[in-house]
């Protein structure tokens, strides 16, 4: 009933709660003297389903058979309509359509930790659309059965609040859940288990790591566990890795030695626990412990390269370069590099510690045989020194690699190829490919890059520190004992026409010809390796095509003579530059009139 129903009643048969697909009979009847005032046959009873009329009848009562009601709640209201007046609400009823509960499935129970409480979950099956009460019962020792009701609309979990203890770990417990509503009831299959089956230990806590004598080879992981734990799983990985190392241990009693950790590496450690070899479940993984392993002395050797530059008749500049050790070789923070320079015949040696740089430049006499040794040091020791005898790397012409070429290979890569030297190719012990940005004036501060290649290789892909639209000077060295030969070439990974032409800064007259001087195009406007310059000239005020002279590009060249100009004729001159991709726009224009005598 949904109203005071003073004027009449609505009855529902067989029940207000019906099974989906059932038929109901709804009767609306007026109480005595509650009809229309004048003539009771004028009573018009109307039945509404929600707001929609579904039936009406003149008289004191109305019967309606209703089918096809949907799942859920449907509201029926009976109203009285009299002539010349509004409809009056008589009474109403709600009908609840649903289904009997399905058998609950997959009942499972767990107790989280030895101090936790038993909680069970199950699958309800399809929604009944009716108020359904679930009762969970747990039977066990001493003939006891604990029960708990759940009155939530969607109940699929209950915590008994009971703590199972290990006094008799083999005792059997049986759980069962029963669903009941107005249309029926259904019970799950029983789930039988022991204490050891359902207790899921809490994850280990208070995880610590100790390195005895600050050594990575003497490492022990410690943790705390609940009292009954028998098994542990340990997993650990370097923080930058996705793959875990796994270890299973029995009766660890909260400690385990790890033997395969790498030095100077941040690791993540986690531990999980279990009460029994084959019963029960593993705990969640513990919170992560992150710890860095101690340093060990570096392994491996530095990759060292050098450059020699002639200063004057008695002195030369040596620039040493080396690459950082990989993290696995450095095995710690490199504090400094030790460079030792020695004159081999006189035995003079000088040692220097370099911090913060991977290069060193010094000036030495041009006479004598010199050698260098470079090693890297961390807090635990030094790497083995890399020894190099300083020689003239390009002295042996017969060792020079032949037919060196440099071609763009995708984005920011250059493929360098060569042919072995004419001299017995088997004498080559290794090739070194060296590259640096091309800077007019041969600036020694420009970073040097190199890679080593095995003697049977005749190509190398260079990609480190390669930028688009920059020209690189590339050298290929063939090394054999204390001798070396080299060949060089210019190359770029990507090019386009230069953004500007050279700027003519002077034109001078010399013995009937002229010498044109220009400023180099700024490196950032060259847009790759320059192949040629072009000098254009034509008579002023002439419409004729200009003449031109094409000069192969050479790094150091910035002047060129022209001897085909007529005396006492005013010419306009300008220059362009070319890469493999095309020609630049004009540089500045200059006028010049040759003063010399006519031929």
């Amino acid at each position: 009933k949904i109203d005071a129903c003073k004027r009449g009643d609505v009855t529902v048969k067989p029940s207000h709660v019906i099974l989906l697909g059932s038929t109901v009979n709804i009767t609306c009847s007026l109480k005595p003297r509650q009809g229309c005032f004048h003539y009771s046959r004028r009573n018009k009873l109307i039945l509404y389903k929600f707001d929609r009329r579904i039936n009406f009848h003149h008289g004191h009562s109305l019967n309606s058979q209703v089918t096809g009601l949907p799942l859920g709640t449907t509201l029926f209201v009976c109203k009285l309509a009299c002539i010349n007046s509004d409809e009056i609400q008589i009474c109403g009823a709600e009908i609840f359509v649903g289904v009997a509960p399905e058998q609950p499935q997959n009942l499972s129970c767990i107790q989280k930790g030895e101090q936790g409480t038993v909680a069970c979950t199950w699958e309800r099956g399809r929604d009944t659309h009716l108020y359904t009460e679930y009762t969970l019962q747990l039977s066990g020792p001493k003939n006891l059965t604990w029960q708990k009701q759940c009155k939530d609309i969607y109940c699929d979990y209950l915590d008994f609040g009971i703590n199972l203890t290990p006094e008799s770990p083999e005792s059997n417990f049986t759980a069962k859940v029963t669903a009941v509503n107005s249309l029926g009831s259904s019970s799950s299959l029983p789930s039988t288990f022991t204490f050891l089956d359902i207790v899921r230990p809490l994850p280990p806590w208070d995880i610590r790591i100790k390195f005895q004598k600050a050594s990575v080879s003497r490492c022990t992981l410690y943790w705390r566990d609940e009292g009954l734990v028998l098994l542990n799983r340990l997993r650990y990985r370097p923080s930058n890795s996705r793959l875990w190392n796994m270890v299973n241990v029995t009766k660890a009693k909260g400690r385990h030695d790890l033997l395969d950790l790498k030095p100077f590496t941040e690791y993540e450690f986690q531990i999980s626990s279990k009460l029994h070899l084959y019963k029960g479940s593993w705990s969640d993984w513990s919170e992560s412990l992150r710890a860095q392993t101690p340093e060990e002395e570096p392994t491996g050797m530095l990759d060292v390269w050098y450059m020699k530059r002639h200063i004057d008749y008695s002195r030369q500049q040596i620039s040493l370069f080396w690459k950082n050790l990989s993290v696995s070789e450095a095995r710690g923070k490199i504090l400094h590099y030790q460079v030792t320079l020695q004159e081999l015949t006189g035995g003079k040696a000088m040692t220097q510690n370099i911090t913060g740089h991977t290069s060193w430049t010094t000036v030495i006499p041009r006479t004598g045989n010199w050698a260098v040794a470079v090693s890297a040091a961390n807090s635990k020791g030094s790497s083995l020194p890399t020894r190099i005898n300083i020689m003239n790397l390009c002295e042996a012409g017969l060792l020079a690699p032949r037919q060196v070429s440099a071609n763009s290979e995708g984005m920011d890569n250059i493929l360098v190829t060569w042919q072995p030297p004419r001299k017995d190719p088997s004498a080559v012990q290794e090739y070194v490919v060296e590259w640096r940005e091309l800077h007019p004036g041969g600036d020694t501060q420009v970073p040097l890059n190199w890679l080593r290649s095995r003697p049977y290789n005749v190509s190398a892909l260079i990609s480190e520190n390669i930028k688009s639209y920059i020209c690189y000077e590339i050298r290929v060295y063939a090394l054999s004992g204390d001798q070396g030969g080299c060949s060089s070439i210019l190359g770029n990974s990507k090019h386009k026409a230069p953004l500007s032409g050279p700027h003519i800064n002077a034109i001078t007259e010399e013995k009937g010809s002229i010498l044109i001087s220009w400023n180099s195009i700024p490196v950032q406007e060259q847009m790759g390796c320059l192949l040629h310059y072009r000098i254009y000239w034509k008579e002023r005020d002439s419409n004729s095509q200009p003449q031109l002279c094409e000069i192969p590009y050479r790094v150091s060249q910035n002047s060129h003579p022209i001897n085909s100009l007529q005396p006492r004729v005013t010419y306009v001159l300008w220059m362009t530059a070319l890469t493999a991709a095309g020609e630049s726009s004009h540089g500045n224009e200059r006028e010049f009139c040759l003063q010399g005598k006519a031929n």
Epitope: Q115, G140, L144, F160, G161, I162, N163
Partner: nanobody, 125 residues
């Protein structure tokens, strides 16, 4: 300190009903497991029913289906509704409480820390 006071006992005919109350004072009751025990003259004290803090409940075999245990934490009271009483239900009824976790073995008197003075229930035939 928790004090427990039982009430609601009395004389009733066989087949009749009684509702026993166990009221707690001194501490909030909601976290406790509460049990009802009874002792007939010349017999051992025996377990009747228990209800824990999460409203899970258990009954001894001889009262199952006849007695209902419930709690009203707002009133700090636990109730034992007894119906279809039999002469063999005659005894002094005690309520008991324990604060710590509910053990499975809530049917043993040793599991409880606090006890009331008891209320007499007599069922005549």
């Amino acid at each position: 300190q928790l004090q427990l006071v039982e009430s609601g006992g009395g004389l009733v005919q066989a087949g009749g009903s009684l509702r026993l109350s166990c009221a707690a004072s001194g501490l909030t009751f909601s976290g406790y497991t509460v049990g009802w025990f009874r002792q007939a003259p010349g017999k051992e004290r025996e377990f009747v029913a228990a209800i824990n803090w999460s409203s899970a409940y258990t009954y001894s075999e001889f009262v199952k289906g006849r007695f209902t245990i419930s709690r009203d934490n707002a009133k700090n009271t636990v109730y034992l509704q007894m119906s279809s009483l039999k002469p063999e239900d005659t005894a002094v009824y005690y309520c008991a409480a324990r604060r710590s976790r509910t053990s499975w073995y809530a049917s043993t008197a040793e599991a409880y820390d606090y006890w009331g003075q008891g209320t007499q229930v007599t069922v005549s035939s």
